[in-house]
Amino acid sequence: MCDAFVGTWKLVSSENFDDYMKEVGVGFATRKVAGMAKPNMIISVNGDLVTIRSESTFKNTEISFKLGVEFDEITADDRKVKSIITLDGGALVQVQKWDGKSTTIKRKRDGDKLVVECVMKGVTSTRVYERA
């Protein structure tokens, strides 16, 4: 069910990411380094366990989860959050919650691309990945 996402993906474009990070509350120094990073995203599936690994000069992170089951995550920008990821209309929809706040990260296939939409309040960032 997540097979369309499996593989290694490289970031090819990023729109409004700094404004999104500002809205999340990420500090200037972290925004600067995170904004310069060009991460590779490696997605794998083993039974009902999905793993998403991000690798960049900024930070390497990895989450392993089962759909619909909440888990603890330390984000690349160093937030400690509670996350839950579900499959909705073919998209992987992640909700992160921390300090009474929440943000939604939607990963979806669009042709041969993987599009990641990050939403915090009224601010949306779109980041596009292609197969590496």
Epitope: K22, G25, V26, G27, F28, A29, T30, K32, V33, M36, T57, F58, K59, T75, D77, D78, R79, D99
Partner: antibody
Framework: QVQLQQPGAELVKPGASVKLSCKAS????????ITWVKQRPGQGLEWIGD????????TNNEKFKSKATLTVDTSSSTAYMQLSSLTSEDSAVYYC????????????WGQGTTLTVSS | EVVLTQSPALMAASPGEKVTITCSVS???????LHWYQQKSETSPKPWIY???NLASGVPVRFSGSGSGTSYSLTISSMEAEDAATYYC?????????FGAGTKLELK
């Protein structure tokens, strides 16, 4: 445990340069930026700049751009700040501190190096 | 540059007294990026409160922080002798990183 070790004192002559060191231990050096802060006697804290050891990327306070050069040696987990064309105005305590991401605050500080510029 | 104005610059409090130090910010910042440090003479600053309201490791629970936008404060519910120190606020929501000038808190 996280530690940032700095030499206690440096004495240099006006017009000379000095390279201050900050040796990190107890964590993965490349995971956190290192910031440098100046404090003149009886005064407040002044941000000089920061460096991300993983990428070597620096962010400098404009006021110190021609004064301070920040570098790292990842093999020894050490951050350096070179101060050039020293004058008495540069006499101060210089702290290095580790940046905690997201919030961008300094969660661990070195003991500080007292720099005295005098002939 | 975002200017942080601390008040008062100097104050004295008796043991058991409630103390409030304020940090006024010249333009609105994210509450995640406003922090407080404690410094005692001849020692390096210590992280005290981060992200407006989170106590750093080892900080007594009599300390608290609050605020949003352009107005922030550090409060001690009941002053103790060991709280005598200088407190600095700091922001890094916007470049460049800036500190307040400090509030020196003395024991009366």
């Amino acid at each position: 445990q996280v530690q940032l070790q700095q030499p206690g004192a440096e004495l240099v002559k006006p017009g000379a340069s000095v390279k201050l060191s900050c040796k990190a231990s107890g964590y993965t050096f490349t995971s956190n930026a290192i910031t440098w802060v100046k404090q003149r006697p009886g005064q407040g804290l002044e941000w000089i700049g920061d460096i991300s050891p993983g990428s070597g990327s620096t962010t400098n306070n404009e006021k110190f751009k021609s004064k301070a050069t920040l570098t790292v040696d990842t093999s020894s987990s050490t951050a350096y700040m070179q101060l050039s064309s020293l004058t008495s105005e540069d006499s101060a305590v210089y702290y290095c501190a580790r940046l905690r991401g997201f919030y961008d605050y300094f969660d661990f500080w070195g003991q500080g190096t007292t720099l005295t510029v005098s002939s | 540059e975002v200017v942080l104005t601390q008040s008062p610059a100097l104050m004295a409090a008796s043991p058991g007294e409630k103390v409030t130090i304020t940090c006024s910010v010249s333009s609105s910042i994210s509450s995640s990026n406003l922090h407080w440090y404690q410094q005692k003479s001849e020692t390096s600053p210590k992280p005290w409160i981060y992200g407006t309201s989170n106590l750093a490791s080892g900080v007594p629970v009599r300390f608290s922080g609050s605020g949003s936008g352009t107005s922030y404060s550090l409060t001690i519910s009941s002053m103790e002798a060991e709280d005598a120190a200088t407190y600095y606020c700091q922001q890094w929501s916007h470049y460049p990183l800036t500190f307040g000038a400090g509030t020196k808190l003395e024991l009366k």
